[in-house]
C-alpha cells in the first residue's frame, strides 16, 4: 500500500550499553476526522491528547505492524521478520536495544473497511544511538523499584539528570495508557501498591531549527517489599504461667511474627528446661498461619499426652528467629486449683 | 481488573473448579481472596492464597475447598458440592497483601448445586 | 473462629443525618486494626470502604468514617445520601487466618 499519506513522527531511543533495557512504540493513528476507522471509540479532536496510544476498542488492537527497509525493498511484516519485536495489541515491544533497530515503522488498521482507511496510518521514525552522555554517571535505571506502603517515585531515565526547573514537559503512559494528570520528569507515589508496578514510557520533544521529534525512556517498575530489621516478635503465648489440670492432655501453641526477608529461613522450636538441663523438644511441625506482604505468622504445637506433677517444675521455652535475632518466651506450668 | 468464570449447575458431589482471572497486576505482590454469598444471605469468608502461594482457609471449610494458582489465575475447586454450596462466588484483591482489605473484586459467579 | 456481630438489620437514617453500625468481635483483631467495612447493593459485589479500622479506601468519600480497636468498631456515615442504601458488613482478620470472618451485615434504609 502506498505510504505516502501515512502521518510521520520521529523518535529517538537513547539506550544504556550498561544495562538492558526496552523500547515500545505505540499505533498512534491520526486524529479521528481522517477516517472512520480511527474514528471509531476515540475521543473528540480536542479532547485527542497529542499522544493517545491506540486503544480502547477492539477494532483497536487489530493493527499490522511493518518495517521500511532503508534499499527501498517493499514492506515487511514484523512478525515474519524481526523475533526480537513483539506486537502486542496496539503496542510494539522491542526486547533488545540496539543500532541496528533504527529505521521506519508502519502501523494500520488490519481491515480497511471504506477508501479513505487506505490513509489511517502512521510512519515512526526511529532513531536508536548509544548513550554518550559521560556527564549524567547516575541516570534512572530502566528498571526501578518502589518499596511497598512507602513514598517513591519513578524518574525518567533520559531526563533524571536535569532538575524539575530545567525538565521539558513529559507526557507518561503506564501500561499503554496515558497519565494525564503526570507531566514532570518524575512521578511521585504518596503510597506504594501493588498496582502500581507496570511498563511506563516518559515522552518528552526535541527540537532544532529543521524538525523536531520525542524522546522515549521505557521504565519497568517494580513493586518490593524490603526486607526486616526486627527480630521476631512471639504474639502466643503472652504470659509465663498457664493453668493446668493433672493427668489431662495440654497443647501450648507458640505463635511468632516474622517480617518479610528475600532470604526466609525462621527458625521456631520448643525446647525444655529442668534444672541444669535442657532439651529440644520434637514436636510437629510448624505450620504459617496468617501470611502479609510485610510480615508471616508461623505457629509451632508443644503436645503433652498428660500433664504430669514433674511437668510442672520445667519450663517450657519456644524459640524464635530469624536473620537478625532470636526471642523466647518461657512457660511455666501451675496446677489448677479447686 | 479481576473476573469469575466456571460458575454452572452441577449435581451434588461432583466436583467443581472456579477460576479467577486477573489482569493489570501480579498475583506476585497481591494476595487474593474467595467469598460467596448464598441467595439472600450475607457474605461467607471463604480464604486466601498469599503472593507466594500459600492457601490459607476459614476455619468451617474443612477440606471442602482448595485454592491454588497460577501467573494470572486463581483456582477454587469445590471439592465435594452439596446444595448448601449453591451461591455465588467471589474473588478479591487485597492490595495490601493482607487477608482483609479487599478492595478489588470480580462481580461473582453462581453455583447452583441441585439434583 | 472468630464471631462478628454487626447491628441488626434494618436500620433507618433520613438524607442529611447520621447513622453508625457497630461491629463486634468475640476477639481481638490481629495488631487490634485489622477491620475492614464493605459497602454492597444488590446484584453488585461488595466494595471496600474502610480498611486497618479507620483508613478510608480509595475514591470513598469522607463522610464515611471508622473506628474502634480490639474488638469493637463502629462505622459512622454522615451527612447520608440516598446511594447510601446499601448492605455493609465488617470483615475481621485475626493472628489466625482460619478465624477471619464477615459480620453478618447491617441493612441502611435511607428515608
Known amino acids: 500500500f502506498n505510504i505516502s499519506g501515512c502521518s510521520t513522527k520521529k523518535l529517538l531511543w537513547t539506550y544504556s550499553t550498561r544495562s538492558e533495557e526496552e523500547f515500545v512504540l505505540f499505533c498512534d493513528l491520526p486524529e479521528p476526522q481522517k477516517s472512520h476507522f480511527c474514528h471509531r471509540n476515540r475521543l473528540s479532536p480536542k479532547q485527542v491528547p497529542e499522544h493517545l496510544p491506540f486503544m480502547g476498542s477492539n477494532d483497536l488492537s487489530d493493527v499490522q505492524w511493518y518495517q521500511q527497509p532503508s534499499n527501498g525493498d517493499p514492506l515487511e511484516d514484523i512478525r515474519k521478520s524481526y523475533p526480537h519485536i513483539i506486537q502486542d495489541k496496539c503496542t510494539l515491544h522491542f526486547l533488545t536495544p540496539g543500532v541496528n533497530n533504527s529505521g521506519s515503522y508502519i502501523c494500520r488498521p488490519k481491515m480497511i473497511k471504506s477508501p479513505y482507511d487506505v490513509a489511517c496510518c502512521v510512519k515512526m521514525i526511529l532513531e536508536v544511538k548509544p548513550q554518550t552522555n559521560a556527564s549524567c554517571e547516575y541516570s534512572a535505571s530502566h528498571k526501578q523499584d518502589l518499596l511497598l506502603g512507602s513514598t517513591g517515585s519513578i524518574s525518567c531515565p533520559s531526563l533524571s539528570c536535569q532538575s524539575d526547573a530545567q525538565s521539558p514537559a513529559v507526557t507518561w503512559y503506564k501500561n499503554g495508557k496515558l497519565l494525564s494528570v503526570e507531566r514532570s520528569n518524575r512521578i511521585v507515589v504518596d503510597e506504594v501498591y501493588d498496582y502500581h508496578q507496570g511498563t511506563y514510557v516518559c515522552d518528552y520533544t526535541q527540537s532544532d531549527t529543521v524538525s523536531s521529534w520525542t524522546v522515549r525512556a521505557v521504565v519497568q517498575v517494580r513493586t518490593i517489599v524490603g526486607d526486616t530489621k526486627l527480630k521476631p516478635d512471639i504474639l502466643d503465648p503472652v504470659e509465663d504461667t498457664l493453668e493446668v489440670e493433672l493427668g489431662k492432655p495440654l497443647t501450648i501453641s507458640c505463635k511468632a511474627r516474622f517480617g518479610f526477608e528475600r532470604v526466609f529461613n525462621p527458625v521456631i522450636k520448643w525446647y525444655i528446661k529442668d534444672s541444669d538441663l535442657e532439651w529440644e523438644v520434637s514436636v510437629p511441625e510448624a505450620k504459617s498461619i496468617k501470611s502479609t506482604l510485610k510480615d508471616e505468622i508461623i505457629e509451632r504445637n508443644i503436645i503433652l499426652e498428660k500433664v504430669t506433677q514433674r511437668d510442672l517444675r520445667r519450663k517450657f521455652v519456644c524459640f524464635v528467629q530469624n536473620s537478625i535475632g532470636n526471642t523466647t518466651q518461657s512457660v511455666q506450668l501451675k496446677e489448677k486449683r479447686g | 481488573s479481576v473476573e469469575e468464570s466456571g460458575g454452572r449447575l452441577v449435581t451434588p458431589g461432583t466436583p467443581l473448579t472456579l477460576t479467577c482471572t486477573v489482569s493489570?497486576?501480579?498475583?506476585?505482590?497481591?494476595?487474593m481472596g474467595w467469598v460467596r454469598q448464598a441467595p439472600g444471605k450475607g457474605l461467607e469468608y471463604i480464604g486466601y492464597?498469599?503472593?507466594?502461594?500459600t492457601p490459607y482457609y476459614a476455619s468451617w471449610v474443612n477440606g471442602r475447598f482448595t485454592i491454588s494458582k497460577t501467573s494470572t489465575t486463581v483456582d477454587l475447586k469445590i471439592t465435594s458440592p452439596t446444595t448448601e454450596d449453591t451461591a455465588t462466588y467471589f474473588c478479591?484483591?487485597?492490595?495490601?497483601?493482607?487477608?482483609?482489605?479487599?478492595?478489588?473484586w470480580g462481580p461473582g459467579t453462581l453455583v447452583t448445586v441441585s439434583s | 473462629a472468630a464471631v462478628l456481630t454487626q447491628t441488626p438489620s434494618p436500620v433507618s437514617a433520613a438524607v442529611g443525618g447520621t447513622v453508625s453500625i457497630s461491629c463486634q468481635s468475640s476477639?481481638?483483631?490481629?495488631?487490634?486494626?485489622?477491620l475492614s467495612w464493605f459497602q454492597q447493593k444488590p446484584g453488585q459485589p461488595p466494595k471496600l470502604l474502610i480498611y486497618?479500622?479507620?483508613t478510608l479506601a480509595s475514591g470513598v468519600p469522607s463522610r464515611f468514617k471508622g473506628s474502634g480497636s480490639g474488638t469493637q468498631f463502629t462505622l459512622t456515615i454522615s451527612d447520608v445520601q440516598c446511594d447510601d442504601a446499601a448492605t455493609y458488613y465488617c470483615?475481621?482478620?485475626?493472628?489466625?487466618?482460619?478465624?477471619?470472618?464477615f459480620g453478618g451485615g447491617t441493612e441502611v434504609v435511607v428515608k
Open positions: 478479591a484483591r487485597d492490595s495490601y497483601a493482607g487477608d482483609y482489605a479487599f478492595n478489588l
Open positions: 470483615l475481621g482478620s485475626y493472628i489466625s487466618s482460619s478465624d477471619n470472618a
Open positions: 493489570g497486576f501480579s498475583l506476585s505482590s497481591a494476595a
Open positions: 492464597i498469599s503472593t507466594s502461594g
Open positions: 476477639k481481638s483483631v490481629y495488631n487490634n486494626n485489622w
Open positions: 486497618g479500622a479507620s
